[in-house]
């Protein structure tokens, strides 16, 4: 069976301040079992934007129903975008582990740029 791939189809997304940004991500397989997370930036200093497993992320909604059986779409929408939200967003698949989940594979990233709010 082919190994899971993380698909982020857009290289870049541009959104006006105050609007919502949709960041698209999908998996090619349901295996391995484990959550997905979204981060802004890469490396040790990356910022957690969304965790499928736990946490409260008031500005983030999932585009499709993540609890739906066989769902492979892990796209998110971030509301009320500000210039501070600019950066590169990574969709990351984790493999279920004990005691901690282990990072399995990351998407290529989508750069979010923020335009000035139309006057």
């Amino acid at each position: 069976e082919d190994e899971l791939q993380v698909i982020q189809p857009e290289k870049s997304v541009s959104v006006a301040a105050g609007e919502s940004a949709t960041l698209r991500c999908a998996m090619t397989s349901l295996i391995p079992v484990g959550p997905i997370m979204w981060f802004r930036g890469a490396g040790a200093g990356r910022e957690l934007i969304y965790n499928q497993k736990e946490g409260h992320f008031p500005r983030v909604t999932t585009v499709s129903e993540l609890t739906k059986r066989n769902n492979l779409d892990f796209s998110i929408s971030i509301s009320n975008i500000t210039p501070a939200d600019a950066g590169t967003y990574y969709c990351v698949k984790f493999r279920k582990g004990s005691p901690d989940d282990v990072e399995f594979k990351s998407g290529a990233g989508t750069e979010l740029s923020v335009r000035a709010k139309p006057s």
Epitope: S12, A26, T28
Partner: antibody, heavy 125, light 107 residues
Framework: QVQLVQSGAEVKKPGSSVKVSCKAS????????ISWVRQAPGQGLEWMGG????????NYAQKFQGRVTITADESTSTAYMELSSLRSEDTAVYYC??????????????????WGQGTTVTVSS | DIQMTQSPSSVSASVGDRVTITCRAS??????LAWYQQKPGKAPKLLIY???SLQSGVPSRFSGSGSGTDFTLTISSLQPEDFATYYC?????????FGGGTKVEIK
């Protein structure tokens, strides 16, 4: 070898709709990006929109927003483009083309490397 | 939407000539640009992707360069089969957009 085979030529009346199909063979259809591009007689290429079946939703060029609907049926590996409220300026050759997918490492910016044969749509009263 | 402007709109050249076509994006697109060749009555053919990567099977006389907003397609020594129309396309962000095309004609 991946192929895209489109439905045949259509003649339509102004105000009506047309639905063109594009059947893919080979490759993993769900992760391909299928774009629709049109070319009016003597004119350049226009990207109308595209869909990646695994996501379900399509992206559209602003010019066609509200008038074009792009869908995909994973069970038959077929993409569809429906254009409504047809006018004479919609007379063109309509192409489907693929990018991304497993063959490219899921890189959708690697260009549209396989094209359908084109479908001529003529809008005339 | 990102606008793509190609120049010239047409060029007359002879076999063996070096031909250069330019494409400018209305905003930065990194190197996410493709070039296509189209002959009358035929579907377009992908020549170059990621601004400078040659598509498999395309002759090495075709080359691409550039990043950001300014890009170039060069045919180093024009062959009879190269007389066609060439289009650039940005694939950085949706909606993808094409340039207006450059027709390479026989002088």
């Amino acid at each position: 070898q991946v192929q895209l085979v489109q439905s045949g030529a259509e003649v339509k009346k102004p105000g009506s709709s047309v639905k063109v199909s594009c059947k893919a063979s080979g490759g993993t259809f769900s992760s391909l990006a299928i774009s629709w591009v049109r070319q009016a007689p003597g004119q350049g290429l226009e990207w109308m929109g595209g869909i990646i079946p695994i996501f379900g939703t399509a992206n559209y060029a602003q010019k066609f927003q509200g008038r074009v609907t792009i869908t995909a049926d994973e069970s038959t590996s077929t993409a569809y483009m429906e254009l409504s409220s047809l006018r004479s300026e919609d007379t063109a050759v309509y192409y489907c083309a693929r990018s991304g997918g497993d063959y490219s490492g899921y890189d959708y910016a690697s260009g549209m490397d396989v094209w359908g044969q084109g479908t001529t749509v003529t809008v005339s009263s | 939407d990102i606008q793509m402007t190609q120049s010239p709109s047409s060029v007359s050249a002879s076999v063996g000539d070096r031909v250069t076509i330019t494409c400018r994006a209305s905003q930065g697109i990194s190197s996410w640009l493709a070039w296509y060749q189209q002959k009358p009555g035929k579907a377009p053919k992908l020549l170059i992707y990621a601004a400078s990567s040659l598509q498999s099977g395309v002759p090495s006389r075709f080359s691409g360069s550039g990043s950001g907003t300014d890009f170039t397609l060069t045919i180093s020594s024009l062959q009879p089969e190269d007389f066609a129309t060439y289009y650039c396309q940005q694939v950085n962000s949706f909606p993808w957009t094409f340039g207006g095309g450059t027709k390479v004609e026989i002088k």
